[in-house]
Interface confidence: medium
Amino acid sequence: FPQDRPFEDTCHGNPSHYYDKAVRRCCYRCPMGLFPTQQCPQRPTDCRKQCEPDYYLDEADRCTACVTCSRDDLVEKTPCAWNSSRVCECRPGMFCSTSAVNSCARCFFHSVCPAGMIVKFPGTAQKNTVCEPASPGVSPACASPENCKEPSSGTIPQAKPTPVSPATSSASTMPVRGGTRLAQEAASKLTRAPDSPSSVGRPSSDPGLSPTQPCPEGSGDCRKQCEPDYYLDEAGRCTACVSCSRDDLVEKTPCAWNSSRTCECRPGMICATSATNSCARCVPYPICAAETVTKPQDMAEKDTTFEAPPLGTQPDCNPTPENGEAPASTSPTQSLLVDSQASKTLPIPTSAPVALSSTGKPVLDAG
């Protein structure tokens, strides 16, 4: 035997260590009640407390609930581990339009490039398909196999990462090319309404159902605990969260302890009649004619927008803007007012409430 080989049974008589034949070395024996963080712990810091299933030990040594990927549009990217949360991402064919900690609050289908456009970059779980005009002389049927990578779902065009233009820019502003970084910077500067629920938050074991900590009498952090699917409104009353159970609605944000669930029209539809935290009537999104061209627009929601030919050439198509003039919405469902006779147009995101005027043209409902 080599002289430095530890005596197997006793590790040189040290009761706080044991010999692991698999790794052929002495390992630290975790105290009763603690679990090793690796196969052969070497020191006390390699031992930890054990959390419940579906909980992980966070940086503060707290057992924290792993996020769940139970929504239909999510899949598990990485599992819940002892020291890290489960990570969810949008399922194949969809991308994340509103991120959340270790998950995605809102997934949209990848765009299908319209006629005359080809795929520049295929969609991923994080980014939408990026389309570009087909090169002159190149058949739209595919210049290369890469350009044929389109989702099989027949969804309407929806998103391209583009910069947010200042509200002061005019209709004649030229599109900004290669503006993804600008868009990200602009999007990061958008402010959320003070009372709107943030989709980014620490996972909790019972979101929306109970306080985050025990509530001793007289504590300033106490709040009334409402029933599941109820939230505490500004007047301190337990109010039922809206339901998104209609076929044409999807959940935008979940029911939380201090905010209602919010619903929006499912992909491919826009809101014709708005309702508090929801939409009373969804109508199919108008599909633009073949000659429309993908145009950079608003990054914040990543909804695909198209540059329309000169106004008046497509009376039945919902034209999209030269610039994204919409401010960050302060309501759960974006509300914009559009003058259908105006010489310049505004973006109509899929979540915006739209009323069809007597002329048949879409007019955004201020809600």
Partner: antibody
């Protein structure tokens, strides 16, 4: 030998609070989750929550959270369960129980504390 | 929360007979290759006593006549030959999700 010894029976009026103690001995108190379980007369068992004495971390059953506070004093190896705004349906035997790591079972239990809520 | 349904509510048997107790969960209790199902025995005036953990592992000191089986959502506690001291109430418990929940219990009584 592992032992969990609970405080004696209590009679309380509706609306008041009760604090039940559970003194542990014979093991590393800080390293095991301490669970609390309710058993109403002639009824089944109901999990209230648990506390990790090492750092005060807690998990609660939503049904009790807000009225129940779990605490632990490492210096005396004692866990506490305080139940506020008592009502008649809180009349029950309350058990503390040590949770094993690995299989999550509760291997050692206190003898139970009967709390009677009556006006 | 996960609902556990125990059946039968009462089992009337004689000493020496075989007892089969069932516990069904409203969703799977599987967790990294094991089922987080536990069985306890409780006698009047006493706290529950751990019998089985991880669905089929017998706790140290528990007689070999006790065994547990099942996975996913369906679990069984079997007492191969009832002894007089086995007449008690038996509870199943799940630890798969917070909050942990118990079944309503099965009372094994002398026939």
């Amino acid at each position: 030998e592992v032992q969990l010894v609970q405080s004696g029976a209590e009679v309380k009026k509706p609306g008041s609070s009760v604090k039940v103690s559970c003194k542990a001995s014979g093991y590393a108190f800080s390293s095991y989750w301490m669970n609390w379980v309710k058993q109403a007369p002639g009824q089944g068992l109901e999990w209230i929550g648990q506390i990790y004495p090492g750092d005060g971390d807690t998990n609660y059953n939503g049904k009790f959270k807000g009225r129940v506070t779990l605490t632990a004093d490492k210096s005396s190896s004692t866990a506490y369960m305080e139940l506020s705004s008592l009502r008649s349906e809180d009349t029950a035997v309350y058990f503390c129980a040590r949770r094993i790591n690995g299989n999550f079972a509760m291997d050692y239990w206190g003898q139970g504390t009967l709390v009677t809520v009556s006006s | 929360e996960i609902v556990l349904t125990q059946s039968p509510a009462t089992l009337s048997l004689s000493p020496g007979e075989r007892a089969t107790l069932s516990c069904r969960a409203s969703e799977s209790l599987e967790y990294y290759g094991t089922s987080l199902m536990l069985w306890y025995q409780q006698k009047p005036g006493q706290p529950p006593k751990l019998l089985i953990y991880s669905a089929s592992n017998v706790e140290t000191g528990i007689p070999a006549r006790f065994s547990g089986s099942g996975s996913g959502t369906d679990f069984t506690l079997t007492i191969s030959s009832l002894e007089p001291e086995d007449f008690a109430v038996y509870f199943c418990q799940q630890r798969r999700k917070v909050p942990s929940t118990f079944g309503g219990g099965t009372k094994v009584e002398i026939k």
